[in-house]
């Protein structure tokens, strides 16, 4: 029985050309994490990290992507383009898989605020 | 072309100790891990240990046969790995090979891991 | 640690016989961190096949990999001379990685 709970970053903005922190957590489970998949609305593959073997980034996202703080992610020189959904995927022995959303709006205004309270989606 | 081409093998007394080096070309070091195998004399492949690469911050990891005695290090600058081995035994008799560790996902989303270029090799002699 | 069991010990064939090559996982592994090495007398080791099926850069095709779970084989179709060797599976995950003990492919 899945019993956890993603937490995430939900609703969040920042400013274009900024960066901004990708963060889940998983509460209320004893399962083990084995894997951490971090994509974007598009379906692609931003960054796993595996609990084994690290972090792999991908190779189109080498240069603006670094992993941490923990199981986030940091996507940094932001573009209008970077708008739209990222998704944690927490794959956990003997639960299964757990999903989280997120939601990431671009802003050109330099008075962008970038939100870090973490709720329940 | 990419290469790999150890140093600093050599005759040392049990007790002891040595530094080995891998020096790396033609590809770009940082991005890799890099793993430390040994052979004894007649024997098969172990795994020493290695090193992650600059987004796993460098992390080591090691056999339990070397823990707490191999200490493995890198600098990416010089494109080089380090072995230092310290309190030698006469087991740690072997060839000692670096190899390039090649760890990503692929499309299909799967985990990939494997030694996909290797040194040739420098000997390490413990005996009194 | 996974013990990686490699059987035959020693496989004594003729060039042009078909050489299948064992390695039993003590529990199951992923196929995708499952790789196979050749090694020569004297030389350094060589990447065969990674995610047990998949053929390294310049490896001639009858060289091939399978199995999935505990059970793994490498085949080679019809044996060339130069394949002659000792080879060594080897998985990474879990940790840590370990290689199996190897079969020596000799000449009959």
């Known amino acids: 029985m899945m019993t956890g709970t993603i937490e995430t970053t939900g609703n969040i903005s920042a400013k274009k050309g900024g960066s901004v922190i990708l963060q889940c957590h998983l509460s209320s489970t004893m399962a083990q994490v084995t894997q951490v998949n971090w994509e974007q609305h598009d379906h692609s593959l931003l960054a796993i990290r595996n609990a084994e073997l690290g972090w792999h980034i991908y190779p189109a996202f080498k240069d603006r992507v670094a992993p941490g703080p923990g199981l986030g992610l940091t996507l940094q020189s932001l573009t209008m383009n970077d708008t739209g959904e990222y998704f944690c995927t927490y794959h956990t022995y003997p639960d299964g898989t757990y999903r989280g959303r997120i939601f990431l709006e671009v802003l050109e205004s330099s008075v962008a605020e970038h939100s870090a309270r973490f709720q329940i989606p | 072309e990419v290469q790999l081409v150890e140093s600093g093998g050599g005759l040392v007394q049990p007790g002891g100790s040595l530094r080995l080096s891998c020096a790396a070309s033609g590809f770009t070091f940082t991005d890799y891990y890099m793993d430390w195998v040994r052979q004894a004399p007649g024997k098969g492949l172990e795994w020493v240990g290695r090193t992650r690469n600059k987004v796993n911050s460098y992390y080591t990891e090691y056999a339990a046969s070397v823990k707490g005695r191999f200490t493995i290090s890198r600098d990416d600058s010089k494109n080089s790995l380090y072995l230092q081995m310290n309190s030698l035994k006469t087991e740690d008799t072997a060839v000692y090979y670096c190899a390039r560790g090649q760890y990503y996902y692929g499309s299909d989303r799967r985990g990939y891991y494997y030694m996909d270029v290797w040194g040739q090799g420098t000997t390490v002699t413990v005996s009194s | 640690e996974i013990v990686l069991t490699q059987s035959p010990g020693t496989l004594s064939l003729s060039p042009g016989e078909r050489a299948t090559l064992s390695c039993r996982a003590s529990?199951?592994?992923?196929?995708?961190?499952l790789a196979w090495y050749q090694q020569k007398p004297g030389q350094a080791p060589r990447l065969l096949i990674y995610g047990a099926s998949s053929r390294a850069t310049g490896i001639p095709d009858r060289f091939s990999g399978s199995g999935s779970g505990t059970d793994f084989t490498l085949t080679i179709s019809r044996l060339e001379p130069e394949d002659f060797a000792v080879y060594y599976c080897?998985?990474?995950?879990?940790?840590?990685?370990?290689f199996g003990g190897g079969t020596k492919v000799e000449i009959k």
């Open positions: 529990q199951s592994v992923s196929s995708s961190y």
């Open positions: 080897q998985q990474a995950v879990p940790s840590p990685l370990t």
